[in-house]
Interface confidence: low
């Protein structure tokens, strides 16, 4: 038989025995001559090296390139392939020789007392026990122990081949400690050497690289990559790395087994690749492959090597961010850099710290943005190695949909006396300012619920036919004033006013404001009454703990059953697009109050007294009167505001001053508080008494000292007191110059 590929114009070596297989008896001589066209060598079984003493290779006497192999008294162990080949080529001729030795049918390895077979417990894998035969057609079975089991060739997955050995599925003998082959010749049993069975695993569960991704270094830094393979037990792992610069001087590879917990069904292997000082050529893909022989798993990661540490903003970094109140705002710091920079956010120059409303990290997150968040935000990136800094300013503009102030200030229902001139106001706050404020109206009787009608939760009015105020036919004569702009509570607001020249008809008015991010509206119930009138005694706006009484006066000949109510918390608050329910048609929202009735010659007066007003008493008070003839109810509503008690404070300071004799001193002391405090002046801790030269004006707020004299020098104190305490300020007045002598002297 011939093996190898023919090289140019070179014939295969020719053997003297032109057969693939030669069978000879033991104790005979084996002689084969090989002829060729260049230097030849022989290889034979067991000892392939040519140092066997019994084997003789001689040059032929009759040819240049010719060698004869001779083995006298052959034994069974000489069975095998004999190969004649050209030196340093693959060209060879092979003959397989069986040396039939019936006393030793299995070829024994020269050195081995026993062999080792490695198997995996894989259903699909077979193992070969290398019990080769010196006779080709033996009846061979495999014995495994313990417990003892015998396996016979089945013509399928179990077989014996004299040149190869005994083939069997590995799982069948994985239980065994040892196996051997057995041949029967003329009722005589012959055994091969023993083979110890070693079960090896092969499964690799995973291969993990650490760090797994985003590896960035700068030139000169150390790269350490750990590759961990997790396998089943009895596995040996061979690691193989692929990386960009394979000719690396400073590369170091360390492989080791990792300890796992006892009883673990898993083994861990670690391979660590270290490059002490990376260069730009080390940038690229690093792949670690772990192989168990039957299985290979790999994992890769990209290593980026920068020339030097750096930091820069990414192209997607925003400069203007627009948001609407209440939204969540996210401003990411988009950067390029190595190593990752330290990120610090500033608002209008002040460092931002994270809290429950704001998170200042890689992304600046404002949970619920409000107007006060408007401003310039500066993000500063600092490279932790080079300390290089980059800054970028992001302007945040927070838009506010129109908010109508009166919604929260004025009652949703109010009554107006017949024939009076009234002004309705919408004060709108919006960013950007509203691009329009429009007024609409509709008649109250067209849109109010009759008591018999079921009130729909989503729409408390059966109609929504709003008409433009330009079309006031059938309603009150209206004039819309030009919008004005006012600074209220430090905010720029747009004020739209609608003047009703004569209150003749009950109607509903709506102002609607629109800007780029939304709309707001306010519905005003303009209920016109010829009925009762409400007055407050003694003050329009009482302070806490003061007494106040609400007087409801009605013509006795027209009205009866006067009753005071307080408007309770409404079950249907007013939303965008909804209208207030007229009070008289919805008594469910009213709380009846105790009151005292008085009469005079023409009117009934129902007085409801609040002896000790508190902030809880604030709200809408309703006086209801019934028409004696028609029994129709008439309502008047009055909003009561109770002012909170505030201790006295003095705004501004008295300042020490130096004045020349004969000049004047003018100082003022402005005090605030509720109830309003009384102001008193003291000189050197004694009450200051008015005389021709000392004048107190405006409730003692202003003090004037005319034609000052030396004796006017001293410590002046302004003191403001109320039931809640006192506040005071002091100043020292110095009088310079000599006192003029009077004529009397």
């Amino acid at each position: 038989a011939s093996v190898g590929l023919p090289s140019v114009s070179l014939d295969l070596p020719r053997l003297s025995i032109q057969k693939d297989i030669l069978t000879i008896k033991a104790n005979t001589t084996l002689q084969i001559t090989c002829r060729g066209q260049r230097d030849l060598d022989w290889l034979w079984p067991n000892n392939q090296s040519g140092s066997e003493q019994r084997v003789e290779v001689t040059e032929c006497s009759d040819g240049l390139f010719c060698k004869t192999l001779t083995i006298p008294k052959v034994i069974g162990n000489d069975t095998g392939a004999y190969k004649c080949f050209y030196r340093e080529t693959d060209l060879a001729s092979v003959i397989y020789v069986y040396v039939q030795d019936y006393r030793s049918p299995f070829i024994a390895s020269v050195s081995d007392q026993h062999g080792v077979v490695y198997i995996t417990e894989n259903k699909n894998k077979t193992v070969v026990i290398p019990c080769l035969g010196s006779i080709s057609n033996l009846n061979v079975s495999l014995c495994a122990r313990y417990p003892e089991k015998r396996f016979v060739p089945d013509g399928n997955r179990i077989s014996w081949d004299s040149k190869k050995g005994f083939t069997i599925p590995s799982y069948m003998i994985s239980y065994a400690g040892m196996v051997f082959c057995e041949a029967k010749i003329n009722d005589e049993s012959y055994q091969s050497i023993m083979y110890i069975v070693v079960v090896v695993g092969y499964r690799i569960y995973d291969v993990v690289l650490s760090p797994s991704h985003g590896i960035e270094l700068s030139v000169g830094e150390k790269l350490v990559l750990n590759c961990t393979a997790r396998t089943e037990l009895n596995v040996g792992i061979d690691f193989n790395w692929e990386y960009p610069s394979s000719k690396h001087q400073h590369k170091k590879l360390v492989n080791r087994d990792l300890k796992t917990q006892s009883g673990s069904e898993m083994k861990k292997f670690l391979s660590t690749l270290t490059i002490d000082g990376v260069t730009r050529s080390d940038q690229g893909l690093y792949t670690c492959a772990a192989s168990s022989g039957l299985m290979t798993k790999k994992n890769s990661t990209f290593v980026r090597v920068h020339e030097k540490p750096f930091v820069a903003f990414g192209s997607g970094m925003e400069s203007l961010v627009e948001a609407t109140v209440g939204e969540r705002v996210r401003i990411p710091a988009k950067y390029l850099g190595y190593p990752p920079p330290e990120i610090k956010w500033y608002k209008n120059g002040i460092p931002l710290e994270s809290n429950h409303t704001i998170k200042a990290g890689h992304v600046l997150t404002i949970m619920e943005v409000s107007e006060r968040d408007t401003g310039n935000y500066t993000v500063i990136l600092t490279n932790p190695i080079s300390k290089e800094k980059q800054s970028h300013v992001v302007s945040l503009v927070v838009y506010v949909p129109p908010q109508i102030g009166e919604k929260s200030l004025i009652s949703p229902v109010d009554s107006y006396q017949y024939g009076t001139t009234q002004t309705l106001t919408c004060t709108v706050y919006a960013i950007p300012p509203p691009h329009h404020i429009h007024w609409y109206w509709q008649l109250e009787e067209e849109c109010a619920n009759e008591p018999s009608q079921a009130v729909s939760v989503t729409n408390p009015y059966p109609c929504e036919e709003w008409r433009s105020v330009e079309d006031f036919q059938g309603g009150n004569k209206i004039e819309v004033n030009k919008n004005q702009f006012a600074l209220i509570e430090g905010k720029n607001k747009t004020v739209s006013t609608l003047v009703i020249q004569a209150a003749n008809v009950s109607a509903l008015y709506k102002c609607e404001a629109v800007n780029k991010v939304g709309r707001g509206e306010r519905v005003i119930s303009f209920h016109v009454t010829r009925g009762p009138e409400i007055t407050l005694q003694p003050d329009m706006q009482p302070t806490e703990q003061e007494s106040v009484s609400l007087w409801c006066t009605a013509d006795r000949s027209t009205f009866e059953n006067l009753t005071w109510y307080k408007l309770g918390p409404q079950p249907l608050p007013i939303h965008v697009g909804e209208l207030p329910t007229p009070v008289c048609k919805n008594l469910d929202t009213l709380w009846k109050l105790n009151a005292t009735m008085f009469s005079n010659s023409t009117n009934d007066i129902l007085i409801m007294e609040l002896k000790n007003a508190s902030l809880q008493d604030q709200g809408d008070y309703v006086c209801l009167a019934q028409d004696r003839k028609t029994k129709k109810r008439h309502c008047v509503v009055r909003q009561l505001t109770v002012l909170e008690r505030v201790a006295p404070t003095i705004t501004g300071n008295l300042e020490n001053q130096t004045t020349s004799i004969g000049e004047s001193i003018e100082v003022s002391c402005t005090a605030s508080g509720n109830p309003p405090p009384q102001i008193m002046w003291f000189k050197d801790n004694e009450t200051l008494v008015e005389d021709s030269g000392i004048v107190l004006k405006d409730g003692n707020r202003n003090l004037t000292i005319r034609r000052v004299r030396k004796e006017d020098e001293g410590l002046y104190t302004c003191q403001a007191c109320s039931v809640l305490g006192c506040a005071k300020v002091e100043a020292f007045f110095i009088i310079e110059g000599a006192q003029e002598k009077t004529n009397l002297e």
Epitope: V457, T458, P569, P571, L572, P573
Partner: nanobody, 124 residues
Framework: QVQLQESGGGSVQAGGSLRLSCVAS????????MGWFRQAPGKEREGVAG????????YYANSVKGRFTISQDNAKNTVYLQMNTLKPEDTAIYYC?????????????????WGQGTQVTVSS
């Protein structure tokens, strides 16, 4: 400080009914939107029903539509969840949730305050 206290949970046979209550203290249910969430064993918390401020609109998850009803009593500052035709898959801890006036709390991200939860067990 805001507190939401649920009650009304318990065990019931499939097909039965329960009414859960949630009393709010330190928080007005009429001025804010409210909702109910539930968390079944091994599952994430999910929105079941919501009601906007003022109670003018109600919202339900598909799984409970037609069987559960959310309502509120402003005077009692209480939100209710009426659960009819209960199924074993309704078994969960039910949580009361409070949001801002808008939107109603149907997802966790808009919830401002949570109750402690009440167990509902429906057996077949």
């Amino acid at each position: 400080q805001v507190q939401l206290q649920e009650s009304g949970g318990g065990s019931v046979q499939a097909g039965g009914s329960l009414r859960l209550s949630c009393v709010a203290s330190g928080y007005s249910v009429s001025k804010n939107s409210m909702g109910w969430f539930r968390q079944a064993p091994g599952k994430e918390r999910e929105g079941v029903a919501g009601i906007n401020y003022g109670g003018t609109a109600t919202y339900y998850a598909n799984s409970v539509k037609g069987r559960f009803t959310i309502s509120q009593d402003n005077a009692k500052n209480t939100v209710y969840l009426q659960m009819n035709t209960l199924k074993p898959e309704d078994t969960a801890i039910y949580y009361c949730a409070a949001g801002s006036p808008d939107p109603p709390p149907l997802i966790e991200g808009v919830v401002k305050y949570w109750g402690q939860g009440t167990q509902v067990t429906v057996s077949s």
